[in-house]
C-alpha cells in the first residue's frame, strides 16, 4: 500500500497507517483487513460507515487522533477491540448498534465529563472498559447493566465523587477494578454485592472516615488480600496486596479497614438490621474520654454530601459526626466511648443549623426537637466567601494496572525511571524526558455553602490543606494532564482568625470556627 | 505450620449432591482468602471456587455455577463446599488451598505453589 504498511501474521492483515499525518481515512486499504492502526494522526472527526467495506475488522486504533467528534453509523458485525484513548471526545458516543460484537473499550484519557444511562446500550459482549484519565464526576446507576460480560473496569484519575450503589449489580466476571485517584469520599451500603472481586484498586480518594465508611470498612477487612496499590512496570500478578493503602482521608492517613467506628449506631440503637449488613462494631483499645454523642438512624436511600463530617472522626461525638444532609431521627445520649490516646478531642463543636447548598433539607439540632434549616441558593449578603490558597504540588506520575495479568495496557504511561521495564507495546521514556514540572493543584467544583452559629471552640481555625492529585501521562512526547481536586468555597457566619495546625479539621475543608 | 484436611468426598449418582469440609490450622483462618481447587484423572489443577475472609463475597468457576456453594464458618476454622446436581465431568481430588503470604491470588494461577490439603475423592458415576 502507498501510505500504510501492510503485513500478514497467520490469519490476521494488520495494517499500519499510524503517524501519517492523516486527516482521513487512507483509500484502497486491503479489503481483508482484521487489524488497522489509525494511532497519532489528525483525524479531528471520524465515520465508522467508512469502514464498512472492511467486513474482516477485529481491532481498530484510533489512539491520539485529536478526535473531537466519532460519527456512528452502519455496523462493523466482528470489530473486537476499539481504542479511542487520548482523544478529545467530550461525550462518548452510542457504540451499541455499530459495534454489537465489541469485547473492549478503551476512551481513557479523553473529555468526558458525563455519561448518559443508556452509553453502552447494546454492548453485551463487552469485557473490558477503560475511562481512566476523563473528567467523570459521577455515573449514571444503571450505566453497566447492558454488560454483564464485563471483567475489567478502569474508572481511575477521574473526579467522581460518589458511586451509584448498583453500580455492579449482575457483574458476576468482573475481577478488576481501577477507582484509585478520584474524589471518592464513601463507597454506598451493598455496592460490591456478593461477588469477590480479586483485584481492586481504591487508593488516592478522600476516604470520609465516619459512621457511614462501616460497610467499606467491613469489605476491606473481608477482602485485604485483594486490595492493591498500582505500581508503574509491575505486572499485576507480581503484585503485592495492601489494604493499608486505602486511607482515611480526615484523620491523618489512618486506613481505613482500621477505623474504629466508636460512636456509631449499633444494631441495636434503632432495630435497623441491615444498616451496616450486620457487620458488628469493633472496640479501640485506649484511655476512655467521655463524649456526647447523637444516636443517629440513617435513612438508607439518602444523598450524601462529603462534607457531612468536617473534621477528624477521632472526636467520635457531637452531631457534626452525622451526615448533614441526612434526615435522621435522634435521641441525644451521653455514654463512655474509647479513644486511642492520639485521638482524645481537643475541642467540643455544637451546630444549631448546618445547611449544603446540594441538600434539600437538614436537621442537626442535638436536641430532641430538630430545628430545620433551608437551603442557601446563594450566599448570604453577610457572608465571606473563602477559596482555598493552592499550594503548589509536583505531580507524580499514576498508572493503573494491566487489563489481564497476561496482556498489557491499553493505555500506557511513563515508568517512573528509564531503567524500569514496562509491560506495554510503547517505549520506556528516554533519560532526556522531562521530570515533571510542579503545578499548583487548583480546586475547581463543587461550590458549598455553610453556614454553621453557636460555635464553641479554644480557637478558631482555618485550614487550606488541598489534596495534591496530579496525573502525568505519556504518549510518545510527554503530555503532562493535571486531575484537578474540587474547588471548595466554604461560606460561614462570623468573624475569623487562621491556624494551621488543628488536626480534628477535615483537610480538604476550609473552616471558619467564630468566636 | 499450615494444615488443611479435607473429607466429605466420596461415590454419587449423577443429580447428586456432597458437602465436602476442609479444616484449617496453623494460620489466622478468619483473615485468609479461600479456594477449592480440583484435579481431574490425568488432567492438571482446575480452580473451582473462592471466598474471600469474611465469608461475604464468592466466586465460581462457569463449570460449576449454580450447582456449587462455597462458604465458611470462621469459628470453627472451617470451610465448606456443597455440591449439587453432580455431573459425572466433577470427577476429581478436590483441594482446598490457601495462598501463601504475599501470594497473588488469581482464578488461573499456578495452583501447586499454594497450601493445599491432601484432597479428598469425589466420584460421580452411576
Known amino acids: 500500500h502507498p501510505i500504510c504498511e501492510v503485513s500478514k501474521v497467520a490469519s490476521h492483515l494488520e495494517v499500519n497507517c499510524d503517524k501519517r499525518n492523516l486527516t482521513a481515512l487512507p483509500p484502497d486499504l486491503p479489503k481483508d483487513t482484521t487489524i488497522l492502526h489509525l494511532s497519532e494522526n489528525l483525524l479531528y472527526t471520524f465515520s465508522l460507515a467508512t469502514l464498512m467495506p472492511y467486513t474482516r475488522l477485529t481491532q481498530l486504533n484510533l489512539d491520539r487522533c485529536e478526535l473531537t467528534k466519532l460519527q456512528v453509523d452502519g455496523t462493523l458485525p466482528v470489530l473486537g477491540t476499539l481504542d479511542l484513548s487520548h482523544n478529545q471526545l467530550q461525550s462518548l458516543p452510542l457504540l451499541g448498534q455499530t459495534l454489537p460484537a465489541l469485547t473492549v473499550l478503551d476512551v481513557s484519557f479523553n473529555r468526558l465529563t458525563s455519561l448518559p444511562l443508556g452509553a453502552l446500550r447494546g454492548l453485551g459482549e463487552l469485557q473490558e472498559l477503560y475511562l481512566k484519565g476523563n473528567e467523570l464526576k459521577t455515573l449514571p446507576p444503571g450505566l453497566l447493566t447492558p454488560t454483564p460480560k464485563l471483567e475489567k473496569l478502569s474508572l481511575a484519575n477521574n473526579n467522581l465523587t460518589e458511586l451509584p450503589a448498583g453500580l455492579l449489580n449482575g457483574l458476576e466476571n468482573l475481577d478488576t477494578l481501577l477507582l484509585q485517584e478520584n474524589s471518592l469520599y464513601t463507597i454506598p451500603k451493598g455496592f460490591f454485592g456478593s461477588h469477590l472481586l480479586p483485584f481492586a484498586f481504591l487508593h488516592g480518594n478522600p476516604w470520609l472516615c465516619n459512621c457511614e465508611i462501616l460497610y467499606f470498612r467491613r469489605w476491606l477487612q473481608d477482602n485485604a488480600e485483594n486490595v492493591y496499590v498500582w505500581k508503574q512496570g509491575v505486572d499485576v500478578k507480581a503484585m503485592t496486596s495492601n489494604v493499608a493503602s486505602v486511607q482515611c482521608d480526615n484523620s491523618d492517613k489512618f486506613p481505613v479497614y482500621k477505623y474504629p467506628g466508636k460512636g456509631c449506631p449499633t444494631l441495636g440503637d434503632e432495630g435497623d438490621t441491615d444498616l451496616y449488613d450486620y457487620y458488628p462494631e469493633e472496640d479501640t483499645e485506649g484511655d476512655k474520654v467521655r463524649a456526647t454523642r447523637t444516636v443517629v438512624k440513617f435513612p438508607t436511600k439518602a444523598h450524601t454530601t462529603p462534607w457531612g463530617l468536617f473534621y477528624s472522626w477521632s472526636t467520635a461525638s457531637l452531631d457534626s459526626q452525622m451526615p448533614s444532609s441526612l434526615h435522621p431521627t435522634q435521641e441525644s445520649t451521653k455514654e463512655q466511648t474509647t479513644f486511642p490516646p492520639r485521638w482524645t478531642p481537643n475541642f467540643t463543636l455544637h451546630m444549631e443549623s448546618i445547611t449544603f447548598s446540594k441538600t434539600p433539607k437538614s436537621t442537626t439540632e442535638p436536641t430532641p426537637s430538630p430545628t430545620t434549616s433551608e437551603p442557601v441558593p446563594e450566599p448570604a449578603p453577610n457572608m465571606t466567601t473563602l477559596e482555598p490558597t493552592p499550594s503548589p504540588t509536583t505531580p507524580e506520575p499514576t498508572s493503573e494496572p494491566a487489563p489481564s495479568p497476561t496482556t498489557p495496557e491499553p493505555t500506557s504511561e511513563p515508568a517512573p525511571s528509564p531503567t524500569t521495564p514496562e509491560p506495554t507495546s510503547e517505549p520506556a521514556p528516554s533519560p532526556t524526558t522531562p521530570e515533571p514540572t510542579p503545578i499548583p493543584t487548583i480546586a475547581t467544583s463543587p461550590t458549598i455553602l455553610v453556614s454553621a452559629t453557636s460555635l464553641i471552640t479554644p480557637k478558631s481555625t482555618f485550614l487550606t490543606t488541598t489534596k495534591p492529585v496530579s496525573l502525568l501521562e505519556s504518549t510518545k512526547k510527554t503530555i503532562p494532564e493535571l486531575d484537578q481536586p474540587p474547588k471548595l468555597r466554604g461560606v460561614l457566619q462570623g468573624h475569623l482568625e487562621s491556624s494551621r495546625n488543628d488536626p480534628f479539621l477535615h483537610p480538604d475543608f476550609c473552616c471558619l470556627l467564630p468566636l | 505450620e499450615v494444615q488443611l484436611v479435607e473429607s466429605g468426598g466420596g461415590l454419587v449418582q449423577p443429580g447428586g449432591s456432597l458437602r465436602l469440609s476442609c479444616a484449617a490450622s496453623?494460620?489466622?483462618?478468619?483473615?485468609?482468602?479461600m479456594t477449592w481447587v480440583r484435579q481431574a484423572p490425568g488432567k492438571g489443577l482446575e480452580w473451582v471456587s473462592a471466598?474471600?475472609?469474611?465469608?461475604?463475597?464468592?466466586r465460581y468457576a462457569d463449570s460449576v455455577k449454580g450447582r456449587f456453594t462455597i462458604s465458611r464458618d470462621n469459628a470453627k476454622n472451617t470451610l465448606y463446599l456443597q455440591m449439587n446436581s453432580l455431573k459425572p465431568e466433577d470427577t476429581a481430588v478436590y483441594y482446598c488451598a490457601k495462598r501463601r503470604d504475599g501470594q497473588n491470588w488469581y482464578p488461573g494461577i499456578s495452583y501447586e505453589s499454594m497450601y493445599r490439603g491432601q484432597g479428598t475423592q469425589v466420584t460421580v458415576s452411576s
Open positions: 496453623g494460620f489466622t483462618f478468619s483473615s485468609s482468602a
Open positions: 471466598i474471600n475472609s469474611g465469608g461475604s463475597g464468592t
